[in-house]
């Protein structure tokens, strides 16, 4: 057993047919010594007497709050949350698996640049009694700060029956070096209850492979006189790192029409512009990714051709 | 300790296209010991990321763009001093600043030079002929740094007596490469920097 | 599968032209653009230019300008490429190619071989 | 127009050891470069796209690799069916042009 926060601890419990459970012994936080009693969440039944209680823990029954009393008055209280481990695995059963990049992948960052801001966020399908409590540090033994937010609910979606919420939360390392080669990478640490039920889940990265810039910005078309061809120009993001003569990104050039089985212009460059040609009905898109270490791409940005 | 921003005349600046072609190399090379060694711990996230130049060379330091000098997270460096005369440095003007950045750079591809050369002559001895380093590599390394002209002594190539131990020689390997690519990154934003300044 | 199926060699004089036809199956044709380009014995590939069969749009290099054109019939599936003012340097395999990418050929026509002679 | 220009364009090889090709552009291209293998009287096929995109069907010997100006066309390990002429085609802009070729023949 160990303290979450105060008066909230968390029994971890292997979770078998007729397991043993754990023993916890609880103690009322008072001077005082006797006609103490206690009973659970709001069950009025006593279910012992005296400054401790011992109990055994086995299932999500014995988990709950407990509270100690005297003469009607409460004195303290302990809420017992449980944490389950089948076949030596602890449970993931509050956040949903997103499956990418890879199997098991329950919590997803994303940074804009290399500021050391960067974004975290988690699907679930439950709805009601769930919090989350985030903390992340650069490197583990000698941990260096970064702050994280709350966590908040960022989206809602249907996927066929069932409603899905996604949760985000932004951190920010608190002494970042841009143009810094990091050689530690950061941990972040998810704490989630549902109800009595508590769980962990952790995400360690180094920015720079979380890096997914901003779609580029101010997209603007110059049809060539005499060609079917246009001169697409475009600027960096205005999150994108500075100077971006260090910083520089590539561009993803794309012309095609609204289905993605459709024909399409494609070329890359380094600069701010490109010459394609457009087709009636289609669209010219840009997306972005750091020149130098290739991680994700942004989204593209779109203008019309007509 | 910073990059100024009046430097070389735009696309004048030599190192540019070898610093591209180092971080291409190096970049396929750990792309080939990633495949090559697949059951090995060669992944980012299974590697324990050393530096090899740390407290020898401060490259990041040196060569921090001037926009970010007053980003005081960027200014922890440790004081370091080196050659000054690179042929890379194409106008008269160029500042001791730069010339430390570039000295930094040269300071650096010389011992990833010397660890890749020793790496790659145990690598050679094993029975398995798994995995050698790419001549490719190497050669753009030895074409950067005479890109950079720097003259400082030569390291000695460390040679081993005892039998090497492959194993550990491969997963060093992974170590190193990962490393390298990290700084071929910085070395190319230099670059890229220094070109377009 | 994909196929582009080509006319058969021909033989032309100088100052003649040719037309040469490319039928595709596998596929919807104006799905794809199409591209002519031609190979002079012993030499390397030269890239004549591309249509578009669902509108017609042409593009073609500008060493060929005013001398090729190319067209489609989208009812036959099938793409011509027309070269005028034949020399004897026009003497060539010349290949159709196709891709949904404008700018590169995944498919390739087997190549019809053109004799430029007097 | 963007010049390619290829090396070598012999390349003497003995079967099962690695082949490396050369392709370099006149000005920088980003990755807009494809590679095509073409066989005495057949038409080429293409091999990479996109500097080193693999293209389903052709074996994984074959990858590309290269940016800008400088690209490399690698077989790890040349079979008796890799004997053929090999042909870069930048795509950056119009007009498409293609390299000289490089043949690959028995060492």
């Known amino acids: 057993i160990w303290e979450l926060k105060k008066d909230v601890y968390v029994v971890e419990l292997d979770w078998y047919p007729d397991a043993p459970g754990e023993m916890v012994v609880l103690t009322c936080d008072t001077p005082e010594e006797d006609g103490i009693t206690w009973t659970l969440d709001q069950s009025s039944e006593v279910l012992g007497s005296g400054k401790t209680l011992t109990i055994q823990v086995k299932e999500f029954g014995d988990a709950g709050q407990y509270t100690c009393h005297k003469g009607g008055e409460v004195l303290s209280h302990s809420l017992l949350l449980l944490h389950k481990k089948e076949d030596g695995i602890w449970s993931t059963d509050i956040l949903k698996d997103q499956k990418e990049p890879k199997n098991k992948t329950f919590l997803r960052c994303e940074a804009k640049n290399y500021s050391g801001r960067f974004t975290c966020w988690w699907l679930t399908t439950i709805s009601t009694d769930l919090t989350f409590s985030v903390k992340s540090s650069r490197g583990s033994s000698d941990p260096q700060g970064v702050t994280c937010g709350a966590a908040t609910l960022s989206a809602e979606r249907v996927r066929g029956d069932n409603k899905e919420y996604e949760y985000s939360v932004e951190c920010q390392e608190d002494s970042a070096c841009p143009a810094a080669e990091e050689s530690l990478p950061i941990e972040v640490m998810v704490d989630a209850v549902h109800k009595l039920k508590y769980e962990n889940y952790t995400s360690s990265f180094f920015i720079r492979d979380i890096i997914k810039p901003d779609p580029p910005k101010n997209l603007q078309l110059k049809p060539l006189k005499n060609s079917r061809q246009v001169e697409v120009s475009w600027e960096y993001p205005d999150t994108w790192s500075t100077p971006h003569s260090y910083f520089s990104l590539t561009f993803c050039v794309q012309v095609q029409g609204k289905s993605k089985r459709e024909k399409k212009d494609r070329v890359f460059t380094d600069k701010t512009s490109a010459t394609v040609i457009c087709r009636k009905n289609a669209s010219i898109s840009v997306r972005a990714q750091d020149r130098y270490y290739s991680s994700s791409w942004s989204e593209w940005a779109s203008v019309p051709c007509s | 300790r910073n990059l100024p921003v009046a430097t070389p005349d735009p696309g004048m600046f030599p190192c540019l296209h070898h610093s591209q072609n180092l971080l291409r190399a190096v970049s396929n090379m750990l792309q080939k010991a990633r495949q090559t060694l697949e059951f090995y711990p060669c992944t980012s996230e299974e590697i324990d990321h050393e530096d090899i130049t740390k407290d020898k060379t401060s490259t990041v330091e040196a060569c921090l763009p001037l926009e970010l000098t007053k980003n005081e997270s960027c200014l922890n460096s440790r004081e370091t001093s080196f050659i000054t005369n690179g042929s890379c440095l194409a106008s008269r003007k160029t500042s001791f600043m730069m010339a430390l950045c570039l000295s930094s750079i040269y300071e650096d591809l010389k011992m990833y030079q010397v660890e890749f050369k020793t790496m790659n002559a145990k690598l050679l001895m094993d029975p398995k002929r798994q995995i050698f380093l790419d001549q490719n590599m190497l050669a753009v390394i030895d074409e950067l740094m005479q890109a950079l002209n720097f003259n400082s002594e030569t390291v000695p190539q460390k040679s081993s007596l005892e039998e090497p131990d492959f194993y550990k020689t491969k997963i060093k390997l992974c170590i190193l490469l990962h490393a390298f690519r990290i700084r071929a990154v910085t070395i190319d934003r230099v670059m890229s920097y220094l070109n377009a300044s | 599968q994909v196929q582009l199926v080509q006319s058969g060699a021909e033989v032309k004089k100088p100052g003649s032209s040719v037309k040469v036809s490319c039928k595709a199956s596998?596929?919807?044709?104006?799905?794809?653009?199409l591209h002519w380009v031609r190979q002079a014995p012993g030499q390397g590939l030269e890239w004549m230019g591309w249509?578009?069969?669902?509108?017609?749009?042409?593009e073609y290099a500008p060493k060929f300008q005013g001398r090729v054109t190319i067209t489609a019939d989208e009812s036959t599936s099938t793409a011509y490429m027309e070269l005028s003012s034949l020399r004897s340097e026009d003497t060539a395999v010349y290949y159709c190619?196709?891709?949904?990418?404008?700018?590169?050929?995944?498919?390739i026509g087997q190549g019809t071989l053109v004799t430029v002679s007097s | 127009d963007i010049v390619m220009t290829q090396s070598p364009l012999s390349l003497p090889v003995t079967p099962g050891e690695p082949a490396s090709i050369s392709c370099r552009a006149s000005?920088?291209?980003?990755?807009?470069l494809h590679w095509y293998q073409q066989k005495p009287g057949q038409q080429p096929r293409l091999l990479i796209a996109?500097?080193?995109q693999s293209i389903s069907g052709v074996p994984s010997r074959f990858s590309g690799s290269g940016s800008g100006t400088d690209f490399t066309l690698t077989i790890s390990s040349l079979q008796p069916e890799d004997f053929a002429t090999y042909y870069c085609?930048?795509?950056?802009?119009?007009?498409?042009?293609f390299g000289q070729g490089t043949k690959v023949e028995i060492k």
């Open positions: 190619a196709r891709n949904k990418e404008l700018r590169y050929f995944d498919v």
């Open positions: 596998g596929g919807t044709f104006s799905d794809y653009y």
């Open positions: 249509i578009d069969p669902e509108n017609g749009d042409t």
């Open positions: 000005q920088s291209i980003s990755i807009n």
């Open positions: 996109f500097a080193s």
């Open positions: 085609q930048q795509s950056n802009s119009f007009p498409l042009t």
